[in-house]
Amino acid sequence: QRFAQAQQQLPLESLGWDVAELQLNHTGPQQDPRLYWQGGPALGRSFLHGPELDKGQLRIHRDGIYMVHIQVTLAICSSTTASRHHPTTLAVGICSPASRSISLLRLSFHQGCTIASQRLTPLARGDTLCTNLTGTLLPSRNTDETFFGVQWVRP
Amino acid sequence: QRFAQAQQQLPLESLGWDVAELQLNHTGPQQDPRLYWQGGPALGRSFLHGPELDKGQLRIHRDGIYMVHIQVTLAICSSTTASRHHPTTLAVGICSPASRSISLLRLSFHQGCTIASQRLTPLARGDTLCTNLTGTLLPSRNTDETFFGVQWVRP
Amino acid sequence: QRFAQAQQQLPLESLGWDVAELQLNHTGPQQDPRLYWQGGPALGRSFLHGPELDKGQLRIHRDGIYMVHIQVTLAICSSTTASRHHPTTLAVGICSPASRSISLLRLSFHQGCTIASQRLTPLARGDTLCTNLTGTLLPSRNTDETFFGVQWVRP
């Protein structure tokens, strides 16, 4: 009763259902605002089916429209902490190839300690997505508090 | 022009497109932090196509990767109210079977009155999802303010 | 390796994968709380595949269950600004036909400057979705800060 069976055993890859859900690995060095991600069943509930990680950044393998979603929670944070360290901002964008560089999704924390959002966007094979966190508060590495994922929706 | 027609009339069940959107029924008794959900066309715009409710908790009927989403709004809430009450936190997790118990998604309200997020996660047939609300502010039962749903994405 | 190829070249329209992602065009005149949207590749990364715009409002062309998502960021906003101009509320609903008018999704900004959420909801051909922003703060027109979209999920 699997979808693949209903498709005369066509491999899922041919259906274009690329999907990935990543957990935070680490933050970048001093001048690098990027978050570095990791994924795979050995790590818990994260996975990559189609997209790949390139030095902690997510690289797309199939053209299409994708749902991109993210949640980032700041560690050891309260509304007081957040407002005292303002501004903390998260931006998700295409960072390579340089010719396609663009910000896709941007949120500020203001007096909150978590941001979460999602959007539909066209992505092309080879696009690498970067998530830039500016500010002086560390993101939580708890897998239920900070995560980043994409889901292929249609060509 | 329906998808099912394009699939030589294969029933949607065989495509694996399980989906549910629930509305809040009630909160639990004193020592039970769980929210209890309800769904069905008679209740408004909530529905269950595949998953089922087991004593107000959502039970998965098909293995796969799911998009889980939730929004909870606190009733009679302002940023002042929120800051004057015990930290209110919402966690979505697998609560049974016990061997698979894990927190999938966690958010604190801080000085806000609404949390909303979503994530991709693998779920297995028989997994029951619980939504635990800790804190002393009641969640709104308005169907446009508090809701919880899952969508099967791929095997 | 496209999905359409796996489906014996059936046009995507027959699969029912209607999808749209819109960017803010402008706000309404004085007594009109609606946001007016625009979409299309010439504008950037917004698009309409199936749904259409009717005077800046999104009209559905295919019955089904949809994932509706939105993010709105207030322009020139800080937590102080937001609390001083409270309440600012965003509501997404079916505004026509009048017989189906209902609020689907509602969020208040409280001390924050961005709201983002998503939900599953049944929509019918001809339903027009309106996004009402009440309050005295302008929404940002930056395409990575304010956007609105729908994705057909199943019949």
Epitope: - | P29, I76, R84, H86, T136, L137, L138, S140, R141, N142 | -
Partner: antibody
Framework: EVQMVQSGAEVKKPGASVKVSCKAS????????IHWVRQAPGQGLEWMGD????????SYNQKFRDRVTMTRDTSTSTVYMELSSLRSEDTAVYYC????????????WGQGTLVTVSS | DIVMTQSPDSLAVSLGERATINCRAS??????????MHWYQQKPGQPPKLLIY???NLESGVPDRFSGSGSGTDFTLTISSLQAEDVAVYYC?????????FGGGTKVEIK
């Protein structure tokens, strides 16, 4: 078992202040707001305000705003209600109360403290 | 402030008979899917005891002869079969907004 134990009866002169204590036990003190409600002899109940022990933030009924102060001592799980510029109409039983799960209704009450204001 | 008006002021009912107490709010206390109306029983020399919360929910340990109903501005507390131990003063209270206010009380006695 949740318990709220209040300090003993007080007799005060008009213009003086009174400070009533309420010691909570049987639950995590910093979790639940504690409210104060008073009842004049033979009269009904009147909500005075509440305090969140987690950070000490208090909210007062406008009627008492200029005269009431609510504080807490987390080390002893005790909250205090001080009422100043006492007048004879402040003669009442003063109750502290808290709730069992959600705020807004009171499942647990102290035994009450009678404050008599008389010259 | 929301004004709570209870009626009647006093009520004499035979043992085993039904007692009904009404409470009217000066404006609606219902929002967000709840009615923020609660009922208490108070006996002489004792603090109030919670009977009903959110208009119709029976507090743990309270006999099921007590029930609450209503929404918006009009609410009712019903004792289906009055017992001797039910002699007391009954108060309604709203928590729709600050300040919370109570009704003036209804004294229930045995006829």
């Amino acid at each position: 078992e949740v318990q709220m134990v209040q300090s003993g009866a007080e007799v005060k002169k008009p213009g003086a202040s009174v400070k009533v204590s309420c010691k909570a036990s049987g639950y995590t003190f910093t979790t639940y707001n504690i409210h104060w409600v008073r009842q004049a002899p033979g009269q009904g109940l009147e909500w005075m305000g509440d305090i969140y022990p987690g950070n000490g933030d208090a909210s007062y009924n406008q009627k008492f705003r200029d005269r009431v102060t609510m504080t807490r001592d987390t080390s002893t799980s005790t909250v205090y209600m001080e009422l100043s510029s006492l007048r004879s109409e402040d003669t009442a039983v003063y109750y502290c109360a808290t709730f069992s799960r959600f705020d807004g209704w009171f499942a647990y009450w102290g035994q009450g403290t009678l404050v008599t204001v008389s010259s | 402030d929301i004004v709570m008006t209870q009626s009647p002021d006093s009520l004499a009912v035979s043992l085993g008979e039904r007692a009904t107490i009404n409470c009217r709010a000066s404006r609606s206390v219902s929002t967000s899917g709840y009615s923020y109306m609660h009922w208490y029983q108070q006996k002489p020399g004792q603090p109030p005891k919670l009977l009903i919360y959110l208009a119709s929910n029976l507090e743990s340990g309270v006999p099921d002869r007590f029930s609450g109903s209503g929404s918006g501005t009009d609410f009712t507390l019903t004792i289906s079969s009055l017992q001797a131990e039910d002699v007391a003063v009954y108060y309604c209270q709203h928590s729709r907004e600050l300040p919370y206010t109570f009704g003036g009380g209804t004294k229930v006695e045995i006829k």
